[in-house]
Interface confidence: low
Amino acid sequence: DTHKSEVAHRFKDLGEEHFKGLVLVAFSQYLQQCPFEEHVKLVNEVTEFAKTCVADESAENCDKSLHTLFGDKLCTVATLRETYGEMADCCAKQEPERNECFLQHKDDNPNLPPLVRPEVDVMCTAFHDNEATFLKKYLYEVARRHPYFYAPELLFFAARYKAAFAECCQAADKAACLLPKLDELRDEGKASSAKQRLKCASLQKFGDRAFKAWAVARLSQKFPKAEFAEVSKLVTDLTKVHTECCHGDLLECADDRADLAKYMCENQDSISSKLKECCDKPLLEKSHCLAEVENDEMPADLPSLAADYVESKDVCKNYAEAKDVFLGMFLYEYARRHPDYSVMLLLRLAKAYEATLEKCCAAADPHECYAKVFDEFQPLVEEPQNLVKQNCELFEQLGEYKFQNALLVRYTKKVPQVSTPTLVEVSRNLGKVGAKCCKLPEAKRMPCAEDYLSVVLNRLCVLHEKTPVSEKVTKCCTESLVNRRPCFSALELDEAYVPKAFNAETFTFHADMCTLSEKEKQVKKQTALVELVKHKPKATKEQLKGVMDNFAAFVEKCCKADDKEACFAEEGPKFVAASQAALA
């Protein structure tokens, strides 16, 4: 399916609006520090060029690859060297090395100010004054902060953002209408970004085999009535889509995602009974709906797995004939029977099965050797089950904030070398697993919890890769994708860690503390808690609880005082002295 002009092909397939949106996202994800106006100018130039190619595919430069066209455009930015330093060296390279170079310079933690939400009236005026610019600004601001955000999904978020303003800016109480919608979009957006980041890490760090295994397991849970061949086809197509998006090929990715949605809707009968309501929706909504669709009901008459994968005398023959196909079929069969397992657990079981076959198929009596393979699965299954049970009990006992604090202490003791902001961010997100998953019925708890934890721990891994400080973190992040969570769970107090010297400045607070939102106050307190544990890693729960209770009382007292700043200045040193004494 070759085209004389790739840029014309994608422009025609996607339409001008989506084309421009995707190019803006691509450029913003590559050059994260560039001003909005600069990106808009580049996008307009690319769009005008694309239109000339649509008119005449033989026109000059229309035959160039998208990487060449986009890379050439990015390399025209005048301030590239000053703003991005060594990233400017990418421009000296030829494709495909140049694009790889740009990809390697994507920054997961860009030094950008947090997005401040203006007053509702200000936002509504901006929306009405220039809707197109307002929405482009949204794409730009999200994309530059989340350089791996799933681009076609970001277009869906932008459409919802537009709909929220269109509806709420006409409402009697604009704020009451708009703010909950914006909060929901923000939270869903962060979750979507983190989920996609794990997909890209899986592809980039562990290869497409790892991603395909994940996809086989997940799609088999979602579509248990589909044949293996059908699941394999979907996995192949989905892998292509995500490989493209993670590689910066956003136009191809969006185009192929639309093709996949079309295929799924045309073949619902052989995939799932749950797709119908998705397939009536417009493209962006349809693709989102298909990605989030609930698991179909399991066929009633599924035979035992043991017959084909344990009892059969042909196990080793079948395995030897086509290892990946045989393991893929095992994973498919196991996953479609176990929507109650996390994908990561299913992958561990497949890995254990593969290891057993590798060992047993070389043994004198292979059948005797692998006869008990399913028994070996039991401890692998029980470990996450117990973990979810214990942590949900703790969450129910403590509530979210204190549960986060328990995790902060736990993870700071495990990996105290990690920066305090990273420990706070990651532990707060780990703590959100409680509210997200513990209220679910038993059969949905483990897939919810463990697969969510995999996403959060991936964030720790990508941040740590940027500035590695802990061999333990590197080991857990790089050795095995499926065993990351058990690896972190198994870490104990780091005995080799030299406690951080006490710094009174870290525990000095001012009156501005009183004007912070509840969330910001929590982050301040949790930052102090991490610093305490770094100073006294062997402090007991009781000691830390005592100090944190004193801290809360001290802040509350000073925030009620007439002269708040004077109170902080006077009570602060007392709190520090009392804390040191309590932890001595």
Partner: nanobody
């Protein structure tokens, strides 16, 4: 049923070239990485080269680097091995496999390099 049928082998003089083909059926060929493996008389199987499912990533054993090129055509469900500058020590039965497996599925194709 997974089937892999190799062809293109033969007798060739040192320094000559051959192009091997492997026709696949019975599985979603485009979903899997593929390899070429060879087995010389009286020796165990030796992995020669591998290619990922999309064809973008290729790997070679040191002994064949720079002389052999692996490729695939997913539409035709066919794997290829272009062998140039052949040496007597390349003499073996060549067979294709799924993934990095060295387990034989097809019959293989005999390559003999001799003057």
């Amino acid at each position: 049923q997974v089937q892999l049928v190799e062809s293109g082998g033969g007798l060739v003089q040192p320094g000559g070239s051959l192009r091997l083909s492997c026709a696949a059926s019975g599985f979603t060929f485009g979903s899997f990485g593929m390899s070429w493996v060879r087995q010389a008389p009286g020796k165990g199987p030796e992995w020669v080269s591998a290619i990922d499912s999309g064809g973008g990533d290729t790997r070679y054993a040191e002994s064949v680097k720079g002389r052999f090129t692996i490729s695939r055509d997913n539409a035709k469900k066919t794997l290829y091995l272009q062998m140039n500058s052949l040496k007597p020590e390349d003499t073996a039965v060549y067979y294709c496999t799924i993934g990095r497996s060295t387990s034989r599925v097809g019959q293989g194709t005999q390559v003999t390099v001799s003057s």
